[in-house]
Amino acid sequence: SGRGEAETRECIYYNANWELERTNQSGLERCEGEQDKRLHCYASWRNSSGTIELVKKGCWLDDFNCYDRQECVATEENPQVYFCCCEGNFCNERFTHLPEAGGPEVTYEPPPTAPTLLT
């Protein structure tokens, strides 16, 4: 596949399950992968009766859904887990739900956080 045009080296990191997994809760993540693999950022969340629960953010490895996407946009209609991915450093800071079948676009703005670098 090869590395993409908008090369991803770092992503926003977040883990709602950080205590159980013994990781940081939030910060920055450096992406790693073999030379022939494209690297992406992702965000995943749940929508419980209109309340957004952020689940994870971080790096994602070589996925055609993410190729050449500058913004993190989830397109599935009504999934159990919302997921978007994109290419470019920190492109997962903001994330959006825009179902392919049409409907309102909803963009989620991140709360300001002090960055912590994860490797």
Epitope: N17, E21, L61, D63, F64, N65, V81
Partner: antibody, heavy 120, light 107 residues
């Protein structure tokens, strides 16, 4: 409903090329999902061989990459596997499967599997 | 490659028993794990994806939990049709890898 059907020779000679096809019915292969090949040697576990998407992007298991080619034929709604220079270690049940839009959705539809024996 | 280790490799249980199977990843995979059931001579069947999401049509006695490196598949009350081999599979890394399987046998 979605159905996958593997086809190809059940016996392949060592050093030859194994060729299998997976015919997809009830679903367009051009939809934005992953199409997978997985194999299972007799009495053993599952091994991912590789994946392809409608655009032709392929993803291969590095342990087999030098010998594997996966291709898609959207006009026939099918995808294929070629594995070259086979040995007895390639004897297995070969499955084709559909995964979701993303890898993490899991492989929700499988073919029934076809047994391939490598022997002279 | 991420190694997936399942335990136990086999378990004997009776109808109505609660059965728990564990899967450990050699490095963190967040919640991106699937579970499959396979019966002899048949293709695997997807039970759970994203660690805890039940695939459509799968009975609610199956449940999944865990994140990071440690995951669990639980069958709350074992039914006769549940005797099979179960596999976990990680999704975020390439190559995709499976656990070695856990065979649930009749006691």
């Amino acid at each position: 409903q979605v159905q996958l059907q593997e086809s190809g020779p059940g016996l392949v000679k060592p050093s030859e090329t194994l060729s299998l096809t997976c015919a997809v019915s009830g679903y367009s292969i051009s939809s934005g999902v992953y199409w997978m090949w997985i194999r299972q040697p007799p009495g053993k576990g599952l091994e991912w061989i590789g994946s392809i998407v409608h655009s032709g992007h392929t993803y291969y298991n590095p342990s087999l990459k030098s010998r594997v080619t996966i291709s898609v034929d959207t006009s026939k709604n099918q995808f294929s596997l070629k594995l070259s220079s086979v040995t007895a270690a390639d004897t297995a049940v070969y499955y084709c499967a559909r995964a979701g839009k993303y890898r993490w959705h899991g492989m929700d539809v499988w073919g029934q599997g076809t047994t391939v024996t490598v022997s002279s | 490659d991420i190694q997936m280790t399942q335990s136990p490799s086999s378990v004997s249980a009776s109808v109505g028993d609660r059965v728990t199977i564990t899967c450990r990843a050699s490095q963190g995979i967040s919640s991106w794990l699937a579970w499959y059931q396979q019966k002899p001579g048949k293709a695997p069947k997807l039970l759970i994806y994203a660690a805890s999401n039940l695939q459509s049509g799968v009975p609610s006695r199956f449940s999944g939990s865990g994140s990071g490196t440690d995951f669990t598949l639980t069958i709350s009350s074992l039914q006769p049709e549940d005797f099979a081999t179960y596999y976990c599979q990680q999704a975020p890394d390439l190559p995709i890898t499976f656990g070695g399987g856990t065979k649930v046998e009749i006691k």
